[in-house]
Amino acid sequence: AAMGSCSKEYRMLLGQLQKQTDLMQDTSRLLDPYIRIQGLDIPKLREHCRESPGAFPSEETLRGLGRRGFLQTLNATLGRVLHRLADLEQHLPKAQDLERSGLNIEDLEKLQMARPNVLGLRNNVYCMAQLLDNSDMTEPTKAGRGTPQPPTPTPTSDVFQRKLEGCSFLRGYHRFMHSVGRVFSKWGESPNRSRR
């Protein structure tokens, strides 16, 4: 659902959330293009691209939250993800520079689709929270009560280090979306039933 419009149909909304999380755990849509564009596609460099522990909630943590708590945590985490993605985008090469280097412009386009897709997912998370009657969540089109700041490494001027930090963040993001997808897959057919 875009622009704050919400479906009132639980199964349809859950289906959209599952589809969105399936897409977002796919590394070919974000991490892999980032690695290619940033010149990290070398075995020795890829080894350095590991998820930073604690950057994202674990699947175990998410499972222990209950539906409302899970949606609130997901909403807040996606807000932080949007900040980091915007920051990563700002430091990507320009399209004309990619062309000169013989790199694939489609990789840049994939990276630039990430933020709108996260926005769409976050809107559906908000809609699901409304459906479950959770009034605590900030409407996605309004400024919040201060967005929780992301667990960001101290900003560095070292270009290579920045690339590695971006890579680690994206690896963690894909893992997180995989965990989110697994949690949603256990949700039942109705708003008040879960599959164990």
């Epitope: 949007l82 900040h83 915007a86 985008e89 630039q112 897709n117 926005l119 769409g120 201060g146 967005t147």
Partner: antibody
């Protein structure tokens, strides 16, 4: 009443520095991303820089990156723009603006009245 | 960077008549069902004022004679019945990616 008031503009020589301030009132400043937008005399609008609510993230127009620094002090409800190595083409009215809407895809809903920066020898 | 091209540069319309301003982006500013395009009005000696956000949403307090439409690369601001107080310069703005960029402006006058 929601209000933004800029100050710190003036005449400065090329290569010089200036620090603009923006005092916010009437809203929870620490909850909003904020931006600077400028307008050269008789010309259109140009986005200059944006800072996140907690100050962790900053975004700049390419031709000011490395010369301008956007910062904020949430305790003082204030936004700043430190401008170094000023050039004639930086001459403009500088507006402070509040960012609202979808996270990172903002638009500007509240603007100050602007402060004029003139770079000339 | 995305270049925003506004047309026409200026427009003279009779009171009560329709005024239409166009904005074309050098690449799509829509994605995932969202249109990241906004419209502003600026009167002489004043800061800009938002009229329309996300292509078609009317900002609170703005008269409903203003409307916005479009998606992808082509967007339109329409004033259905021009009033004397609508004389101003109008700008489009995209927020699809950084840097956000404005159109060059359209000056609207009374014929």
């Amino acid at each position: 009443e929601v209000q933004l008031v800029e100050s710190g503009g003036g005449l400065v020589q090329p290569g010089g520095s200036l620090r603009l301030s923006c005092a916010a009132s009437g809203f929870t400043f620490s909850s909003y991303w904020m931006s600077w937008v400028r307008q050269a005399p008789g010309k259109g609008l140009e986005w200059v820089a944006t800072i996140s609510d907690g100050g962790s993230f900053t975004y700049y127009l390419d031709n000011v990156r490395g010369r301008f620094t956007i910062s904020r002090d949430n305790a003082k409800n204030s936004l700043y723009l430190q401008m170094n190595s000023l050039r004639a083409e930086d001459t403009a009215v500088y507006y402070c603006a509040r960012d609202v809407g979808h996270t990172t895809f903002w638009y500007f809903d509240v603007w100050g009245r602007g402060t004029l920066v003139t770079v000339s020898s | 960077d995305i270049v925003m091209t506004q047309s026409p540069d200026s427009l003279a319309v009779s009171l009560g008549e329709r005024a239409t301003i166009n904005c074309r982006a050098s690449k799509s500013v829509s994605a995932a069902g969202y249109n990241f395009m906004h419209w502003y009005q600026q009167k002489p000696g004043q800061p800009p004022k938002v009229l329309i956000y996300y292509a078609s949403n009317l900002e609170s307090g703005v008269p409903d004679r203003f409307s916005g439409s479009g998606s992808g690369t082509d967007f339109t601001l329409t004033i259905s019945s021009l009033q004397a107080e609508d004389v101003a310069v109008y700008y489009c703005l995209h927020s699809r990616e950084f840097p956000f960029t404005f159109g060059g402006g359209t000056k609207v006058e009374i014929k």
